[in-house]
């Protein structure tokens, strides 16, 4: 399939102009190569009419231009003074010959329609309302008023002042006068449908003294807006149907021959093919809404339509907006795993690609939720604190310059199964969707920490060991201390007299962490993990409680926070060993000014990131960089 895309079907009227936009993949070669517009000729040859090299055929002399917009990866062909001779089959394309990459375009130029004298032309979109104005003289002020539609030679009454309404206009047509006006009546026709188009005659009075007005009604199908998107990227359909449908259910559907199949609506319907990768977001009280689809697939290409109706389904005579989506398979977005599998108690490391040109952008990870129209609350981000319920088991590792960041989630439970999105505050195309599937564990985890009930005593030495299997022998082992802004790898042995140290006993495949001497702020979550370069692997977590050993009082163990991962995976509560009012950050709302569907990460200001009262009784250390 050619990666060039444009309008399949262009229609205009004699004497008018058209502007045709063609899209091409965003590459350096494409930006600079020749662009052309040619017409399908005899023997299948496509003869150039205009090109970016400066060629202009004599048929187009003085009436056409071709402009390249490399920053948008588009070029535009403008043709003026159209004649019916221009009706035909064309191609817009790229390359040194006209056999290269191209897109077929049909151009239809119609005759200027001929109407009787004094015909008022009304042009309205499908689903909208037209108000036809009918003037009359004072002599017909008390006479019968009517509107009829021309069908051949006959004129069939649509509505009249005796309250007759043609059945096909029932509940759609009204005839009325405004205020004290004595020389004009109006007919409103609402919920316009294509078959309403045609010539109407309004009349006041009968016989030769009747006043007549001609009105031509044109009912327009929505012109689809073209959207050119890369495979695996995302697309947003912005739908603005007007205030008159603000309170009706909204939908987005995909055209399928004669029907339009609903993908999502505000009544809770959602096509399973879009599960985990779609969000519908109301924009304001005027009926504006947007639909975001991530992880675009080849089969997502096609014609889409948004609309509003109380049923949440497409309905003839209701306003719609249309798009044609083209999915370019020559994508710059790398192919990444769409399904990641884990087991209860285990961990997953999810690699999130982002635009390498935007390494300083803020990175986020959110959990797609199916309720209502779909939403994606942020769980962790480079400047967003970890959401409640994920403390000690979720961290984001940025790898600047690599074009990817890694999100690690451990102490997995089956409730973690679902869809997650990787996103940044930069290039919105680089959103990826991952489905996490968590199955019940059938064997012991690869990494095991001893002792499992970890309580360290202030001032003493505390060692904790992480046992790993031989398959991890060649990988780098590490311990890190989890905090709300990541998991900071602990320094090696020689990096400070009082620092935590890491050493590895290769013979018994153990990596140990020693705290010497233990301080109150050492309390918290620690992770043992393996990695190869910047590729993170398995992790396991342990909560280290710190207490003061007081003489003469019995030693009371704090609640074992590690039970959450081991014995009671579903349990969310942690008692005195972790402060319950852990600070969280609000995402800057400007990051997602057009993407309110991604929920903010917390309920407190970003400035409160570092935890206060470090070292207070029962408080968690606010260890931050």
């Amino acid at each position: 399939q050619s990666p060039i895309f444009g309008p399949q079907d262009v229609s205009s009227i004699e004497g008018n102009s058209v502007s045709i936009t063609c899209y091409y993949p965003d590459t350096s070669v494409n930006r600079h190569t020749r662009k052309y517009w040619c017409r399908q000729g005899a023997n299948g040859y496509c003869a150039t009419l205009i090109s970016s090299n400066g060629y202009l055929s004599k048929e187009y002399s003085g009436r056409a231009s071709l402009i390249n917009f490399p920053e948008n990866s588009t070029f535009v062909i403008n043709i003026a003074h159209l004649t019916q001779e221009d009706t035909g089959s064309y191609k817009c394309g790229l390359g040194t010959t006209n056999r290269g990459l191209f897109f077929d375009v049909s151009l239809e130029v119609s005759q200027v329609p001929e109407f009787p004298n004094d015909t008022h032309v009304y042009t309205k979109d499908i689903g909208r309302t037209v108000t036809i104005e009918c003037r009359f003289k004072e002599g017909n002020a008390h006479s019968k008023k009517s509107l009829c539609k021309k069908r051949g030679e006959a004129c069939e009454v649509v509505i009249d002042s005796t309250e007759y309404v043609d059945p096909s206009y029932k509940d759609r047509a009204i005839l009325f006068m405004k205020g004290t006006s004595r020389d004009i009546f109006y007919v409103n026709i609402s919920h316009l449908i294509p078959s309403d188009a045609g010539l109407y005659v309004c009349q006041a009075g009968e016989g030769p003294s009747a006043d007549k007005n001609n009105a031509d009604l044109q009912v327009l199908e929505p012109e689809p807006e073209l959207l050119y998107k890369d495979l695996r990227s995302s697309v947003t359909f912005e739908c603005d149907l007007g205030r008159e449908v603000a309170n009706d259910a909204k939908y987005l559907c995909r055209k399928n021959k004669e029907t339009c199949d609903v993908i999502i609506n505000t009544l809770g319907k959602r096509d399973p093919a879009f599960e985990g990768r779609i969000l519908l977001t109301p924009r304001d009280d005027n009926g504006r809404f947007s639909v975001l689809i991530t992880g675009l697939r080849k089969e997502d290409a096609g014609h889409y339509q948004c609309g509003a109706h109380s049923s949440g389904l497409p309905q003839e005579g209701w306003p719609v907006q249309a798009w044609q989506l083209f999915v370019n398979e020559e994508s710059t977005i790398p192919n990444s795993r769409s399904v990641v599998k884990g087991v209860t108690g285990g961990s997953v490391a999810i690699v999130c690609p982002y635009n390498p040109k935007e390494s300083s952008s803020l990175k986020y990870w959110c959990h797609w939720e199916a309720d209502e129209n779909g939403r994606c609350p942020v769980l962790v981000g480079t400047q967003a604190l970890v959401q409640e319920g994920y403390e000690g088991r979720l961290a984001l590792f940025d790898q600047p310059g690599s074009g990817a960041y890694t999100v690690i989630l451990n102490q997995l439970t089956t409730q973690d199964s679902g869809f997650y999105w990787c996103l940044t505050d930069g290039d919105s195309r680089w959103r990826t969707t991952i489905e996490l599937q968590v199955a019940e564990a059938t064997k012991k985890p690869d990494l095991e920490v001893t002792p499992q009930n970890a309580t360290a005593v202030i001032g003493e030495t505390f060692t904790i060991s992480c046992h790993y299997p031989c398959k991890f022998y060649s990988q780098e082992k590490y311990w890190c201390k989890w905090s709300n802004d990541g998991c900071h790898i602990l320094p090696s042995h020689d990096e400070g007299a009082r620092q935590s140290s890491v050493s590895c006993d290769q013979s018994s495949q153990i990596v140990s962490m020693t705290l010497n001497p233990v301080k109150k702020e050492d309390e918290g979550w620690y992770w043992c993990g393996v990695k190869e370069g910047q590729v993170y692997g398995e992790t396991t977590a342990i909560y280290v409680a710190v207490e003061e050993r007081t003489r003469g009082s019995p030693h009371i163990n704090p609640t074992d926070a590690n039970a959450r991962a081991k014995d009671a995976p579903e349990e969310e509560a942690m008692e005195s060993s972790v402060r319950e009012d852990e600070n969280k950050a609000n995402l800057d709302p400007r990051l997602f000014a057009d993407e309110r569907e991604i929920q903010n990460a917390g309920d407190q200001a970003q400035e409160n990131r570092a935890s206060g009262n470090a070292g207070s009784a029962g408080g968690q250390s606010g260890s931050s960089k």
Epitope: Q8, D9, R39, Q40, G41, A42, N43, G44, Y45, A47, S57, K58, E59, E85, T87, G88, S89, D104, V105, S106, E108
Partner: nanobody, 119 residues
Framework: QVQLVESGGGLAQAGGSLTLSCAAS????????MGWYRQTPGNSREFVAR???????HYADSVTGRFTLSRTQDKNTVSLQMNSLKPDDTGVYYC?????????????WGQGTQVTVSS
């Protein structure tokens, strides 16, 4: 040179159906657009339907939803399926093929086939 041969005209009742066919021969490979026009009593020749080389079809408002234009894989034969016929559809139907020579548009016409719709 393009030759167009029409078939399928005849008499039909109002509400009934007919199918017209048009086969192109000669330099048919260069056909740009193919379709049908009609001449009804007392009127000039008017556009009915056409199909472009990218399979886009256009119809006159008066036949939209009732007539369907299709063509064969080799693109040399077009068929006009006419349903829900009305007396107003009575007339001579002409097949049209348009070729663009590289500098000018040439329209080729069939001989015409009579369609009569009785009420």
């Amino acid at each position: 040179q393009v030759q167009l041969v029409e078939s399928g005209g005849g008499l039909a009742q109002a509400g009934g159906s007919l199918t017209l066919s048009c086969a192109a021969s000669g330099t048919a490979a260069g056909i740009d657009v193919m379709g049908w026009y009609r001449q009804t009593p007392g009127n000039s020749r008017e556009f009915v339907a056409r199909i472009f080389s990218n399979d886009v079809t256009h119809y006159a408002d008066s036949v939209t939803g009732r007539f369907t234009l299709s063509r064969t894989q080799d693109k040399n034969t077009v068929s006009l399926q006419m349903n829900s016929l009305k007396p107003d559809d009575t007339g001579v139907y002409y097949c049209n093929a348009r070729i663009w020579t590289g500098s000018t548009t040439v329209d080729y016409w069939g001989q015409g086939t009579q369609v009569t719709v009785s009420s």
